[in-house]
């Protein structure tokens, strides 16, 4: 089971109108550049076999991947939103740094790996898709971690 006290984000993180709006604007800008509408990265399949108490830990993994492998490499694009949203998401990642689960997390890593593989397979368009789904990342983090 997760060390649940550490797998928590305060509700106030998701109640800041300005940065929330910027996050959603960034997602919209990127989704307009996303031609591959047949693929969904963040959806029901991501959570398959993952209990409610493990979902924040899963979303931490997705957040970290999105920051390191998508947002940092694409940081020159989608300005001015990117320069504001990346530090916000990095702060959330930092707050989840002590979120771990005890025991086997193979089922979680398997699901996250599928997402990573899809992004990598699609190349730059996979990165654009991941940015276009930042609204879903935001909502999934909110639901899983508060």
């Amino acid at each position: 089971a997760p060390i649940s006290s550490h797998c928590r984000l305060d509700k106030s993180n998701f109640q800041q109108p300005y940065i929330t709006n910027r996050t959603f604007m960034l997602a919209k800008e990127a989704s307009l550049a996303d031609n591959n509408t047949d693929v969904r990265l963040i959806g029901e399949k991501l959570f398959h076999g993952v209990s409610m108490s493990e979902r924040c830990y899963l979303m931490k993994q997705v957040l970290n991947f999105t920051l390191e492998e998508v947002l940092f490499p694409q940081s020159d694009r989608f300005q001015p939103y990117m320069q504001e949203v990346v530090p916000f998401l990095a702060r959330l990642s930092n707050r989840l740094s002590t979120c771990h689960i005890e025991g086997d997390d193979l089922h979680i890593q398997r699901n996250v790996q599928k997402l990573k593989d899809t992004v990598k397979k699609l190349g730059e368009s996979g990165e654009i898709k991941a940015i276009g789904e930042l609204d879903l990342l935001f909502m999934s983090l909110r639901n899983a971690c508060i």
Epitope: F24, E44, H48, M139
Partner: antibody, heavy 119, light 107 residues
């Protein structure tokens, strides 16, 4: 082409039961959340229930909780609504609709099936 | 539950008019708002999702705006086919909830 076809509506007496079906085609049914929405004669739209693609999560409106069960058979591309302890206020056209996930709109709707609860 | 309040409930307009319908949520729903068009005896059709994205097949004269609690649907130049009832719907949280509808009539 996406198609959703509801069936099973009809006249039922108060306290009675009915099972509605929705046959889906033209898309990967198991990938989609499915919802039932109803519309009483001359009234607005009221969401009734939803079920996840796997069938593992279900959601209900307070007005029907305990009287209605949503289910699906992905092998048959079918959605169901089991209704019991029916009341006159349940009289409505019942639509099935699909939405990819939790944060997705209802992008396709069936034509609906009329349920009339009357003595 | 999130309450959705739509206004006006009835709207009379002429061909070529610019028409605006508003929808207010009882709490913040980010951009998780859809607009549907319904004609008598027919199922609703999706027009707008994520508050401002045009659904596939929806005419470009329809546009949506807003975020948080206040949203609008605009028809830039009313066409004969647009006389119908319009509903907003939030999908930020279950239970999904609809506005009461706006009936658009010919003046």
């Amino acid at each position: 082409e996406v198609q959703l076809v509801e069936s099973g509506g009809g006249l039922v007496t108060p306290g009675g039961s009915l099972r509605l079906s929705c046959a889906a085609s033209g898309f990967t049914f198991s990938d989609y959340y499915m919802s039932w929405i109803r519309q009483a004669p001359g009234r607005g739209l009221e969401w009734v229930s939803a079920i996840s693609g796997s069938g593992g999560s279900t959601y209900y409106a307070d007005s029907v909780k305990g009287r209605i069960t949503i289910s699906r058979d992905n092998a048959k591309n079918s959605l169901y609504l089991q209704m019991s302890s029916l009341r006159s206020e349940d009289t409505a056209v019942y639509y099935c609709a699909r939405g990819l996930w939790v944060w997705d709109p209802l992008d396709y709707w069936g034509r609906g099936t009329l349920v009339t609860v009357s003595s | 539950d999130i309450q959705m309040t739509q206004s006006p409930s009835t709207l009379s307009a002429s061909i070529g008019d610019r028409v605006t319908i508003t929808c207010r949520a009882s709490e913040g729903i980010y951009h998780w708002l859809a607009w549907y068009q319904q004609k008598p005896g027919k199922a609703p059709k999706l027009l707008i999702y994520k508050a401002s994205s045009l659904a596939s097949g929806a005419p470009s004269r329809f546009s949506g705006s807003g975020s948080g609690t206040d949203f609008t649907l605009t028809i830039s130049s009313l066409q004969p086919d647009d006389f119908a009832t319009y509903y907003c719907q939030q999908y930020s949280n279950y239970p999904l909830t609809f506005g009461g509808g706006t009936k658009l009539e010919i003046k």
